[in-house]
C-alpha cells in the first residue's frame, strides 16, 4: 500500500490528519459513502480539541460524525472504542426519539448548532465531514 | 490527454467469466475513485460498480453483487471488472468512468469509449 | 434507491430551436444532478454537474436549473452537433448514481 504524506487539495491538515468539510447535505449512509471513495471516513472526534477544530470549521450547522447504533451498540466507524472513548452529547442524548414520525428511531450521530452531538435520523440530510489519516499506510488489496 | 481505453469483451456463454480492463493516461489514477458502467443495447445507463483509489472501498449494483468483482493495479493504472456466472441480461456495453469531484458534487467526468459484452449461447 | 424519470422520451426540433428537457427524482436529491450527452455508438460527455454548472469546454447554449425534484435541462439555440440522447443523473445516493431513462433529441 501506499502512505499519504500529504493532505489532498481542498483538505484541511490538523495533527496529522485531513479534513474535509462539506457545504450541502446527504444522508448518513452517503455521505459515509462519499468519505469512503476518498479513502477517508465520516470524522472520528477523540478528544476535546478536535472537537473544538471540527466545530470551528462547520459553524452552527447539523452535521454528520462517524458515529452510529444501526446495529445496536454505538459505533465510530474507524472501529475506536466508544465506551472508553470521548463523547460530547446534549443533555438527555443519545435519546433514540421516535417520535418524529419517519418510521424507527434515531440512529446516527450529528454535530448539533452548539458543536454537542445529538442522534438523529440517518436519512436526514445533513452536511458531513471526512477525515483520514497521514502516515497510514492506505488499504490496496492484492490482485486475485 | 485524459484518456481511458477498455478491453476484455466479447461473446461468452451464460454462466461463463470474463474480465475488462480499463487503462488509464493522462491523470494521477491512484488519486482518483473510479467506476463501471454498462448500456444494454438500445437501452439507458446503468451504475455497475465504484472502487476508491486506492482500491481498499468498493461498492455494487445490487444486479451484479456477488457475482462481479471491481479492482485496479495502480502500478498499472489500470482498472478490472472481473464478471462470473454471466447472464444473457449482462449484455451490455461496458464503460470505465473516471469519478470527478467538484465540491460537495460528483460526476463521472472521463469515459472510455466501452467494450461489448455478449451473454449468448 | 432513487428513480430518475425524463420527459419527453423523444422529441424533435430544427436548428435555432430552444429545447428543454425535464427531469425527475423520486425524492428530493437537493442539486445532485448531472446531465449526459451521448451520441450514437459513442460514450456519454458530461455536460452538467451540481444541476447548474457547466461542465469545462461546454458550450453556454447549455444550462441547467432546479431543486428538490424537478430539473430542467436547456438548450437556448440547437446546433446540429447537438442532435443527440440526454440522459440526466442522481448523484445524491454516493455510489450508486442512478440515470433517468433518456430523452432523444432528432432533427424535425
Known amino acids: 500500500g501506499s502512505e499519504r504524506t500529504c493532505c489532498p487539495v481542498n483538505w484541511v491538515e490538523h495533527e496529522r490528519s485531513c479534513y474535509w468539510f462539506s457545504r450541502s447535505g446527504k444522508a448518513w449512509a452517503d455521505a459515509d459513502n462519499y468519505c469512503r471513495l476518498e479513502d477517508a471516513h465520516l470524522v472520528v472526534v477523540t478528544s476535546w480539541e478536535e472537537q473544538k477544530f471540527v466545530q470551528h470549521h462547520i459553524g452552527p450547522v447539523n452535521t454528520w460524525m462517524g458515529l452510529h447504533d444501526q446495529n445496536g451498540p454505538w459505533k465510530w466507524v474507524d472501529g475506536t472504542d466508544y465506551e472508553t472513548g470521548f463523547k460530547n452529547w446534549r443533555p438527555e442524548q443519545p435519546d433514540d426519539w421516535y417520535g418524529h414520525g419517519l418510521g424507527g428511531g434515531e440512529d446516527c450521530a450529528h454535530f448539533t448548532d452548539d458543536g454537542r452531538w445529538n442522534d438523529d435520523v440517518c436519512q436526514r440530510p445533513y452536511r458531513w465531514v471526512c477525515e483520514t489519516e497521514l502516515d497510514k499506510a492506505s488499504q490496496e488489496p492484492p490482485l486475485l | 490527454e485524459v484518456q481511458l481505453l477498455e478491453s476484455g469483451g466479447g461473446l461468452v456463454q451464460p454462466g461463463g467469466s470474463l474480465r475488462l480492463s480499463c487503462a488509464a493516461s493522462?491523470?494521477?489514477?491512484?488519486?482518483?475513485?473510479m467506476n463501471w458502467v454498462r448500456q444494454a443495447p438500445g437501452k439507458g445507463l446503468e451504475w455497475v460498480s465504484a472502487?476508491?483509489?486506492?482500491?481498499?472501498?468498493?461498492f455494487y449494483a445490487d444486479s451484479v453483487k456477488g457475482r462481479f468483482t471491481i479492482s485496479r493495479d495502480n502500478s498499472k493504472n489500470t482498472l478490472y471488472l472481473q464478471m462470473n456466472s454471466l447472464r444473457a441480461e449482462d449484455t451490455a456495453v461496458y464503460y470505465c468512468?473516471?469519478?470527478?469531484?467538484?465540491?460537495?458534487?460528483?460526476?463521472?467526468?472521463?469515459w472510455g469509449q466501452g467494450t461489448m459484452v455478449t451473454v449468448s449461447s | 434507491d432513487i428513480q430518475m424519470t425524463q420527459s419527453p422520451s423523444s422529441l424533435s426540433a430544427s436548428v435555432g430551436d430552444r429545447v428543454t428537457i425535464t427531469c425527475r427524482a423520486s425524492?428530493?436529491?437537493?442539486?445532485?444532478l448531472n446531465w449526459y450527452q451521448q451520441k450514437p455508438g459513442k460514450a456519454p460527455k458530461l455536460l452538467i454537474y451540481?444541476?447548474?454548472s457547466l461542465q469545462s469546454g461546454v458550450p453556454s447554449r447549455f444550462s441547467g436549473s432546479g431543486s428538490g425534484t424537478d430539473f430542467t435541462l436547456t438548450i437556448s439555440s440547437l446546433q446540429p452537433e447537438d442532435f443527440a440522447t440526454y440522459y440526466c443523473?442522481?448523484?445524491?445516493?454516493?455510489?450508486?448514481?442512478?440515470f433517468g431513462q433518456g430523452t432523444k433529441l432528432e432533427i424535425k
Open positions: 425524492q428530493s436529491i437537493i442539486s445532485y
Open positions: 451540481g444541476a447548474s
Open positions: 472502487i476508491s483509489g486506492s482500491g481498499g472501498n468498493t
Open positions: 443523473q442522481q448523484s445524491y445516493s454516493t455510489p450508486m448514481f442512478s
Open positions: 493522462g491523470f494521477t489514477f491512484s488519486s482518483y475513485a
Open positions: 468512468a473516471k469519478r470527478g469531484v467538484y465540491g460537495d458534487y460528483e460526476a463521472f467526468d472521463i
